[in-house]
Interface confidence: medium
C-alpha cells in the first residue's frame, strides 16, 4: 500500500523558518503535489506550493522555496514574518496525486520537544485520505 | 465554506466588450483551487463549458468564444476573470463561475469534479 511521509523541521539559524520534507512511499508514477498547511487543501487547509513534475511549481507566502528533492519527494522552505508565519504546532499537509494509485495525503507538525535545528527523522505519518 | 462571487455583467451592444471578475473567499482559510473556469447558460438552453485556467496558467476554450474570449486568474488574490471582446447576441446567457481541484492541477473536460459555484451574472447583448 503506497504512503506518504512528511517531516517538519523548524531551522537553528532562523527560528520563525520551517522546513517541510514529503516523499511518496509507492510505485507510481507522481503527477501533482500540493502541500497545505492548517489541514487539507480545501477542507480548512491554506495551500502553500502545487508541484508539478513537468509544468512547474507554484508557491504563495510565506512559502520561500518549494523544489523537489528526488522523483518522489519535495521540500519546501517557510520564512516565517509577521501574521503569516507559521507556529511550533502548525500541521503541515502533503498530497501526492500518483498514477495508477490516486492520491494519498498526509500530515504532520513540529514534534513537540523538538530543539531548533533538529527534526523527528521522516516516518510515515497516517495516511488522512485516498481519493 | 467556499464561496464564488461574479461581477461585471450587463447590457452591451453587439460588438462590444465586458469584463467579468470572480473572487474566490473562504472562512478562516485561503482557498487555491486548481482549476478555475467560466461556464454559461442561455435562456431555455443547457448549462455551457465557456473557459478554464488551471493553476499552472494552462487554458482551455469553447470553440464558440476561441479568439473573442480571454480567461485568466491571479492566484495572489484569488480572482479569475473573463475578458470578452466582439461579444454577440448569442453570448447573452447568464455566466458561472466553477471552481474546484483534480488529480493533475489540470481543468477536467466538462467541469467534472468543479465543486464550488457562484451564483452568475447576467451578460446580454443586444442593440
Known amino acids: 500500500t503506497p504512503e506518504v511521509w512528511v517531516q517538519v523541521r523548524m531551522e537553528a539559524t532562523e527560528l520563525s523558518s520551517f522546513t517541510i520534507r514529503c516523499g511518496f512511499l509507492g510505485s507510481g508514477s507522481i503527477s501533482l503535489v500540493t502541500v497545505s498547511w492548517g489541514g487539507p487543501n480545501g477542507a480548512g487547509g491554506t495551500t502553500l506550493a502545487v508541484l508539478h513534475p513537468e509544468r512547474g511549481i507554484r508557491q504563495w507566502a510565506p512559502a520561500r522555496q518549494a523544489r523537489w528533492e528526488t522523483q518522489s519527494s519535495i521540500s519546501l522552505i517557510l520564512e516565517g514574518s509577521g501574521a503569516s508565519s507559521p507556529c511550533a504546532n502548525t500541521t503541515f499537509c502533503c498530497k501526492f496525486a500518483s498514477f495508477p494509485e490516486g492520491s494519498w495525503e498526509a500530515c504532520g507538525s513540529l514534534p513537540p520537544s523538538s530543539d531548533p535545528g533538529l527534526s523527528a527523522p521522516p516516518t510515515p505519518a497516517p495516511i488522512l485520505r485516498a481519493d | 465554506e467556499v464561496q464564488l462571487v461574479e461581477s461585471g455583467g450587463g447590457l452591451v451592444q453587439p460588438g462590444g466588450s465586458l469584463r467579468l471578475s470572480c473572487v474566490a473567499s473562504?472562512?478562516?482559510?485561503?482557498?487555491?483551487?486548481?482549476?478555475m473556469a467560466w461556464f454559461r447558460q442561455a435562456p431555455g438552453k443547457g448549462l455551457e463549458a465557456v473557459a478554464g485556467?488551471?493553476?499552472?496558467?494552462?487554458?482551455t476554450y469553447a470553440d464558440s468564444v476561441k479568439g473573442r474570449f480571454t480567461i485568466s486568474r491571479d492566484n495572489a488574490k484569488n480572482s479569475l476573470y473573463l475578458q470578452m471582446n466582439s461579444l454577440r447576441a448569442e453570448d447573452t446567457a447568464v455566466y458561472y463561475c466553477?471552481?474546484?481541484?483534480?488529480?493533475?492541477?489540470?481543468?477536467?473536460?466538462?467541469?467534472?469534479?468543479?465543486?464550488?459555484w457562484g451564483q452568475g451574472t447576467m451578460v446580454t447583448v443586444s442593440s
Open positions: 466553477a471552481a474546484g481541484d483534480s488529480p493533475d492541477g489540470r481543468c477536467p473536460p466538462l467541469g467534472q469534479g468543479l465543486n464550488y
Open positions: 473562504a472562512s478562516g482559510f485561503t482557498y487555491r483551487p486548481y482549476c
Open positions: 485556467i488551471d493553476i499552472f496558467g494552462g487554458t
